[in-house]
Structures are given as C-alpha cells and as structure tokens.
C-alpha cells in the first residue's frame, strides 16, 4: 500500500528528494499567491507595504547563478522559519479584521510546516548542519490598529511569495547541476 | 490593458551585441516575472531565462548562458535582454512573455523582436 | 532536457469538426495535483497565445471549446468545434524542470 499520506518517501537520490521539496514549495507559492489576491480584494493595498522584522530577500542581481545547495537551503530555512512566526502571530493578533481569512491563514501555516520539515529532512540526508538564525529574532507586538494589521499581512504575504519564487527558482537551478 | 511592448527590429553584424527593450503595462510590474523566448525560423520555440523584476535576480538556459543577459529597469517597468557575440544561428525572433512566478507558463507575450545577423 | 513530441505534425479539418491535438513528453511532467504542461496558440505573423495551462486551467479570455486533459507523459488539447479562427499552429510547453522546453508544434489547417 506505500507509506501513509504525507509521510516522506525514503530515497537517497538527492535529485529525487529535491523533487519533492520543489512540489511542496511550488504548491505553496501557489496558495500564497491565490491568498495574497483574496487580501488584495477584501483588503485593497496601496502600494508596497513592509516589516522591519521580515528577512531582507535573498535573492539579488548575479546571485543566483553563483548558488550552492546547502546555503540555498539553509537560508530558505531560516528564512521560512520567519514567516511561519509571522503567520503565526498574524493569526493570533491581526484582529478581527483578518479573522474572515482564518481558515486559509491556518491552511498557510500547516503547509509552511510541512515545507519545514520536508528541507529538515532534505538537509539531515545531505548531511547538512540545521543551522540556527543568525540574527536575533525580534519579538513581534500587537499591530497598531486594525490598518496596521492589513498592512503587516500585505507585507508577509507578498515577502513569502517573492522568497518561494526565489526557492523554487534556485531548487530547480540548483537541480539541473545535481 | 495589459500589454507588453517590444523595441524594433536590428540588424546585426556576426560578433557584434544586440539589447533589445520590453515595456511593461496595465499591470504591477514586479508580481510576476519576466522570460525571453527565441523563434527562430523553422526551430521550435525556445526559453532563453527570465528574471524577477523585484529582486533583478536572472536564470538563464545553460544554452544561453554566457551570451544572454536579462536586466530590468523597475522604475520604468522595463525588461532588457542582450545578446552578445552574435552569429547567423541568432537570426531569430524574440519575444518577451510575462511569467506566473514559480511555474513558468506565459499569459502575456510582447510582439516580438526580429534580429537578423548577417555579414 | 525533457522532450515534448506533438502529433499530428499537421491536421486538416472542417470548421464544425472537432479536433484532438497530442504532446507527449520524453518523462512524467506530473506530480501529485500538478500536471506542468500548458498550451498555446499562435497565428502567422503574431506572437504565441496562452490557451491552457497547468494541463486543464482555461487562460483568462479564452473560449470554453479549447479544453486540456492529460497527465504523465500523455497530454491532449481538444476544439469541440472548430471556428474559422482556430486554424493555426498550437504548441505544448512544460515546466516541469529547468528549462521549460516546447513541442515542435501541430499546424491546424482549413480542409
């Protein structure tokens, strides 16, 4: 019958682990997107919102081509360790306002943590060190207002798209060279 | 309307450098990114690379990489490819296509640019 | 690179007809929920036309007679019923893997 839902298939092709890594990150690029449009509709944004306590986007001009697996890795870990917090915190403290959008926001975060656990599995079998943040992580208030709480989802959501693009293109870079 | 622009076409001489222009809009230029397909006359289309306009970040088919470069202008909603040490095979044309981040399938295309390389 | 292999290389057909159009990939382009194949249209003189993508997603404006099924290696873009504007040549397209590579092409002409 194979293994049960959910759990990862034993493989020690790193081209085939990488594989599943990539489906889950797609798929979550794609609920991101389609929750980023949800907010857009319910919420209109006006223009680019931001978050000091995001991680800065780990891609730049020349750096892709320049990638290694195990630091591709290790910064999209540390990296969506941050968002998970800040879904986290946007579902326990966005308000009433984000409440209409719980359900989805819920659904983000239970494919954050698979997405978490699949790279934790990926880099344990590639030997690799589960390292820690390097910055300190800054404890995230209660939004301002109500205003402030749309504005801080706006922003997690539009970063975490841009990182899963970022994942998605440098994973399957990174795979053609395996 | 959302619409892609591209620059005209060029006449190029083999070794020499080509840039061609595509502008953006009717939409939020940096939500999706931007891919740079060739068609050259009885070939099959192919994906030289794209880049992601919000972080300036290009990828490119190893077929084209060392020869292809994808730059953007956020400002300007502007994307730029640029071909260098052009040969006859680079006789072609060149479309720019918006790309849905992440899974590579392309729901607006530029008119295309036609560049011929000939002595 | 993966290889996408369409069939027939031409087809003839009356407006009214229906039309089967293949794309078959040199390796599985499907993984659980996703099928990365998409398909365009494109007339001479004019750049390619979304039509379909991730297998079976109706792009935005196009008409409900242009539908895709397939998974796998097996793909299959079908026109109910063929208008006067259909005759073109169409193109499958994956994005499975790095690089996203094309079909050769099937060219739909007016029997």
């Known amino acids: 019958p194979g293994p049960p839902a959910g759990s990862p298939r034993v493989s020690s092709d790193p081209r085939a682990d990488l594989d599943s890594a990539v489906l889950l990150t797609r798929s979550l690029l794609a609920d991101t997107r389609q929750l980023a449009a949800q907010m857009r509709d319910k919420f209109p944004a006006d223009g680019d919102h931001s978050l000091d306590s995001l991680p800065t986007l780990a891609m730049s001009a020349g750096t892709l081509g320049s990638l290694q697996l195990p630091g591709v890795l290790t910064r999209l870990r540390v990296d969506l360790m941050s968002y998970l917090r800040h879904v986290q915190w946007l579902r326990r403290a966005g308000g009433p306002s984000l409440k209409t959008l719980e359900p989805e926001l819920g659904a983000l975060q239970a494919r954050l943590e698979r997405l978490l656990r699949r790279l934790q599995l990926l880099m344990s079998r590639l030997a690799l060190p589960q390292a820690a943040p390097d910055q300190p992580v800054i404890p995230l208030g209660p939004p301002a207002s109500a205003w402030g709480s749309i504005r801080a989802a706006h922003a997690i959501l539009g970063g975490l798209h841009l990182t899963l693009d970022w994942a998605v293109r440098g994973l399957l870079l990174l795979k053609t060279r395996l | 309307e959302v619409q892609l622009v591209q620059s005209g076409a060029e006449v190029k001489k083999p070794g020499a450098s080509v840039k061609i222009s595509c502008k953006a809009s009717g939409y939020t230029f940096t939500d999706y990114n931007m891919d740079w397909v060739k068609q050259a006359p009885g070939q099959r289309l192919e994906w030289i690379g794209d880049?992601?306009?919000?972080?300036?970040?290009?990828i490119y088919n190893q077929k084209f990489t060392g020869r292809a470069t994808l730059t953007v202008d956020k400002s300007a909603s502007t994307a730029y490819m640029e071909l260098s040490s052009l040969r006859s095979e680079d006789t072609a044309v060149y479309y720019c296509?918006?790309?849905?981040?992440?899974?590579?399938?392309?729901?607006?295309w530029g008119q295309g640019t036609t560049v011929t390389v000939s002595s | 690179d993966i290889v996408l292999t369409q069939s027939p290389a031409s087809l003839a057909l009356s407006p009214g007809e229906r039309a089967t159009l293949s794309c078959r990939a040199s390796k599985s382009v499907s993984t659980s929920g996703y099928s990365y194949i998409h398909w365009y249209q494109q007339k001479p003189g004019q750049a390619p036309r979304l039509l379909i993508y991730l297998a079976s997603n109706l792009a935005s404006g196009v008409p409900a007679r242009f539908s895709g099924s397939g998974s796998g290696t097996d793909f299959t873009l079908t026109i109910s019923s063929l208008e006067e504007e259909d005759f073109a040549t169409y193109y499958c397209q994956h994005s499975r893997d790095l690089p996203p590579t094309f079909g050769q092409g099937t060219k739909l002409e007016i029997k």
């Open positions: 880049i992601n306009p919000h972080q300036g970040g290009p």
């Open positions: 296509a918006r790309g849905e981040l992440g899974h590579w399938y392309f729901d607006v």
